[in-house]
Interface confidence: low
């Protein structure tokens, strides 16, 4: 597993990916399992109540490089990891929801620390 | 079910240490994104925030109150406290704790009167 | 620190009737990027914790009556109780959560005239 800004060695990618799908199933899955060209993702967001909710599932290869790579926005409490490196790799995957930070670190409107590993394998 | 219920010293003199206890069930504080406040309000007087404990630790104090304010957790036994050092007389008032930044779920308070 | 300003102080009504009261803020509270408001408003009943009424701005907590409704953007926010209940009197709070330190204003007090 790498930090965030350490590069990560190309590896070998399944044809198919196999991946643990929860909240985001497609109608096609079995046993919470969907398939993807591209990557397993787990990601952590507020809802409306302020609740946290996780969800994972299956990225294509489209995209999925921008959706996997987690910039940070103020005030969007979302945290997001991918991985690639074997079948359900995304069961291993605990991404944190940064909080909103003290004004005092921080130009601008807020207001998160990040302390979530991001957990990126091409 | 979420609930949250302070408790406190009741009376306590000037200059000494204020310890509150925030103890709450129906949610947890090892869940990612899961944090706690504490707000007090004077009698017949307003809110003010005071202080916030998140799940991985941060803290956030206010400003005006920084340098007397300690926040802390016991995530096991779902609780959080705070401590006010040095207290005066302006630090009467119920002490409540919350869940959240829009403060959802509210405790009952706590009085705590500051008197020589 | 941004400063939470309501008004008025205090509000006489009548039973039925419809009431405004207005939060004013030193700086916005809507976030671009979302286009959401990141305040709340509270209602507070003697001797009673504050309860949690709007957040988001204009968003009902679940379980608040529909004659309550919250609306505004940016700096300037509006608490509306359509048709005024007994029950209803109470003072309320707006509180921002755009930043820390988190700060409320000083409280609408809604009475019997």
């Known amino acids: 597993k790498k930090e965030d800004g350490e590069s990560t060695a190309p590896t070998a990618r399944p044809k198919v990916l196999r991946c643990k799908c929860h909240h985001h199933c497609p109608e096609d899955s079995v046993n919470n399992i969907c398939s993807t060209d591209g990557y397993c993702f787990t990601m952590i967001e507020e809802d409306d109540s302020g609740t946290p909710v996780v969800t994972s599932g299956c990225l294509g290869l489209e995209g999925s490089d921008f959706q996997c790579r987690d910039t940070p926005i103020p005030h969007q409490r979302r945290s997001i990891e991918c991985c690639t490196e074997r079948n359900e790799c995304n069961k291993d995957l605990h991404p944190t929801l940064p909080p909103l930070k003290d004004r005092d670190f921080v130009d601008g409107p807020i207001h998160h620390k990040h302390h979530h590993h991001h957990h990126h394998h091409h | 079910q979420v609930t949250l219920k302070e408790s406190g010293p009741g009376i306590l003199q000037p200059s000494q240490t204020l310890s509150l206890t925030c103890s709450f069930s129906?949610?947890?504080?090892?869940?990612?994104?899961?944090?706690v406040g504490w707000i007090r309000q004077p009698s017949g007087k307003g809110l003010e925030w005071l202080a916030h404990i998140w799940w991985n630790d941060d803290k956030s104090y206010n400003p005006a109150l920084k340098s007397r304010l300690t926040i802390s957790k016991d995530t096991s036994n779902n609780q959080v406290f705070l401590k006010i050092a040095s207290v005066v007389t302006a630090d009467t008032a119920t002490y409540y704790c919350a869940r959240g930044d829009r403060f959802a779920y509210w405790g009952q308070g706590t009085l705590v009167t500051v008197s020589a | 620190d941004i400063v939470m300003s309501q008004s008025p102080s205090s509000l006489a009504v009548s039973v039925g009737e419809k009431v405004t009261m207005s939060c004013k803020s030193s700086?916005?509270?809507?976030?671009?990027?979302?286009?959401?408001?990141?305040l709340a408003w509270y209602q507070q009943k003697p001797g009673q914790s504050p309860k949690l009424l709007i957040y988001?701005?204009?968003t009902r907590e679940s379980g608040v009556p529909d004659r309550f409704t919250g609306s505004g953007s940016g700096t300037d926010f509006t608490l509306t109780i359509s048709s005024v209940k007994a029950e209803d009197l109470a003072v309320y709070y707006c509180?921002?959560?755009?930043?820390?330190?988190?700060?409320f204003g000083a409280g609408t007090k809604l009475e019997l005239k």
């Open positions: 129906g949610l947890s504080l090892s869940t990612p994104g899961m944090s």
């Open positions: 988001w701005a204009s």
């Open positions: 509180q921002q959560y755009y930043s820390f330190p988190l700060t």
């Open positions: 700086q916005s509270l809507l976030y671009s990027n979302n286009q959401k408001n990141y």
